[in-house]
């Protein structure tokens, strides 16, 4: 009679993380009588995974059933699979005794766990930043195995790239993290703007997880200001609009000022808001310049989402106050940007609330 | 270490039955089948019956077929022989034994139950 | 079924000597490259101890005094040198198809 030997026909097996792992093993003889056990890696610290003899073992159902005569398939299957139970697994034949004795191991079968990578999550800046600051975004994906990935940055559908990318640890592990931090130039039309990471690996099959974020959270679009005089609405009144375009977010209160004291406060409501989700909003301020002696100077100061205001001013010259309704005024418009901001035609108002 | 502890001695009447148990312990119950031997007094073997604990499956010696009965209980790991419509001549030392490797063997023994067939 | 006969009923051998017990089976008792044929040892009091399997194959912790040989239907069990506790009755049993005993051969010191 030939020497009984331990056959492990696969060499290596790679199974879906929550899926069931055979794992193959046949013995070539029925001597010496004695249990098989399976166990996890090689040497004292080797890791029992299944004993014929005794011990519960709930994940482990053998294959073939070990009882009936002449039964000479111990594979088994482990169920459940997750990356902690990668490894190489090893069917031994013991020889029956007090106690039982190793008598001879399989070559060994490595068990690999593919497991898919979480959701990527983007997140961006603590802070919002102005159109031509460069913000960063990371992305972060866990629990993949093997460890090749590949990690792409979009914006817009435009590919990014300008990013740096960690897959951790570095050495041989049971499931990988990536890290990934991308720089992304923000401009005016970004409101509407997504960053996308996007992680493909042999997990899904081609069809790549995406994170995104939505530049609407990070960017900050300063308004411009211009206060204009609209004609006479009636005798001896002037009425000063303020308009605060293409500002973003929302968050924005407006204080008016004659000569330095605050004639009154609001806060942004109907606003309208513009193609590239901007808003336009209007404010304005009837004066009645026969209550002036002086000149007068009417500033509109805007705070937009908690930054330092910014304001315009316009010059009303009080002097003399014509009695027909209608003509024109001795106030003259002398207004000055004090923010140094540009204005430029709003041409893409959706429509226009006047708001007072 | 393998462990089969049967049940004490049982004196019966003719035409009774008795069931006797072997708790097993040392080894996976479910994994390695039961046999049942019986010695009369100053003879040789008698092969009944054995069961496989994991599914029940049984094979009985024809002149027991009739009579004996083998059962498992997995959850307390024992084992039952019941033997009805009993003789004297079935006054006996009754072993159950283990069979380790599967090859329809004795491996391991329980000590006996001794029963005593008598009017 | 099968029968099992062995011979001699009864021996008895010197200490140191060797003792032969045979078992001759009414058909083979060979299948699948193995002989299914077991020998057991029984001494008094005591329930029965496998000491060879297989046909040839010492069981764990037999002395090696003890070999078994044969194939088919005829089979041997030896003790090369008899020892005082070998004093027993040895029964041969196969599982070829159910188990079956032989009815047994008692050993004694002569």
């Known amino acids: 009679e030939e020497e009984l030997q331990v056959i492990q026909p696969d060499k290596s097996v790679s199974v879906a993380a929550g899926e069931s792992a055979i794992l193959h093993c046949t013995v070539t003889s029925l001597i010496p009588v004695g249990p098989i056990q399976w166990f996890r890696g090689a040497g004292p610290a080797r890791e029992l995974i299944y004993n014929q003899k005794e011990g519960h073992f709930p994940r482990v159902t053998t294959v073939s059933e070990s009882t009936k005569r002449e039964n000479m398939d111990f594979s088994i299957s482990i169920s459940n699979i997750t990356p902690a139970d990668a490894g190489t697994y090893y069917c031994v034949k013991f020889r029956k005794g007090s106690p039982d004795t190793e008598f001879k191991s399989g070559a060994g079968t490595e068990l690999s766990v593919r497991a898919k990578p979480s959701a990527p999550v983007v997140s961006g800046p603590a802070a919002r930043a102005t159109p031509q600051h460069t913000v960063s975004f990371t992305c972060e994906s866990h629990g993949f195995s093997p460890r090749d990935i590949t990690l792409k940055w979009f914006k817009n559908g435009n590919e990014l790239s300008d990013f740096q990318t960690n897959v951790d640890p570095v050495g041989e592990s049971v499931s990988y993290s990536i890290h990934s931090t991308a720089k992304v130039v923000l401009t005016r039309e970004d409101v509407h703007s997504q960053v996308i990471c996007e992680v493909a690996h042999v997990t899904l099959q081609g069809d790549p997880l995406r994170g995104t974020a939505n530049l609407s959270e990070t960017i900050r679009v300063p308004p411009t200001l211009e206060v204009t005089q609209q004609p006479v609405r009636a005798e001896n009144q002037v009425n000063v609009t303020c308009q605060v375009r293409k500002f973003y977010p929302q968050r924005l209160q407006l204080t008016w000022l004659e000569n330095g004291n605050v004639s009154r406060t609001e806060t942004a409501s109907t606003v309208t808001e513009n193609k590239d989700g901007t808003y336009n909003w209007m404010s304005w301020l009837l004066v009645n310049v026969s209550a002036h002696r002086d000149d007068v100077k009417l500033t509109c100061q805007v705070e937009h989402d908690g930054q330092p205001a910014v304001s315009k001013s316009h010059d009303l010259k009080v002097s003399a106050h014509p009695k027909e309704q209608g003509s024109n005024t001795a106030a003259e418009n002398t207004g000055s940007n004090e923010r140094g901001s540009s204005d430029y035609k709003d041409d893409d108002d959706k429509h226009h609330h006047h708001h007072h | 270490q393998v462990q089969l502890v049967q049940s004490g001695a049982e004196v019966k009447k003719p035409g009774a039955s008795v069931k006797v148990s072997c708790k097993a312990s040392?080894?996976?119950?479910?994994?390695?089948?039961i046999n049942w031997v019986r010695q009369a007094p100053g003879q040789g073997l008698e092969w009944i019956a054995m069961?496989?604990?994991?599914?029940?499956?049984?094979h009985y010696n024809q002149i027991f077929k009739d009579r004996a009965t083998l059962t498992t209980d997995t959850s307390t790991s024992t084992a039952y022989m019941e033997l009805r419509s009993l003789r004297s001549d079935d006054t006996a030392v009754y072993y159950c034994?283990?069979?380790?490797?599967?090859?329809?063997?004795?491996?391991?023994w329980g000590r006996g139950t001794l029963v005593t067939v008598s009017s | 079924d099968i029968v099992l006969t062995q011979s001699p009923d009864s021996l008895a051998v010197s200490l140191g000597e060797r003792a032969t017990i045979n078992c001759r089976a009414s058909?083979?008792?060979?299948?699948?490259?193995?002989?299914?044929l077991f020998w057991y040892q029984q001494k008094p009091g005591q329930p029965p101890k496998l000491l060879i399997y297989?046909?040839?194959n010492r069981d764990s912790g037999v002395p090696d005094r003890f070999s078994g040989s044969g194939s088919g239907t005829d089979f041997t069990l030896t003790i090369s040198s008899l020892q005082a506790e070998d004093v027993a009755v040895y029964y041969c049993?196969?599982?070829?198809?159910?188990?079956?005993f032989g009815q047994g051969t008692k050993l004694e010191i002569k």
């Open positions: 058909k083979s008792v060979g299948s699948s490259g193995y002989n299914w």
């Open positions: 049993q196969h599982s070829r198809e159910l188990p079956t």
């Open positions: 034994a283990m069979d380790y490797g599967s090859l329809y063997a004795m491996d391991y």
């Open positions: 069961i496989d604990p994991s599914d029940s499956e049984t």
């Open positions: 040392g080894y996976t119950f479910t994994n390695y089948w």
């Open positions: 297989l046909a040839s």
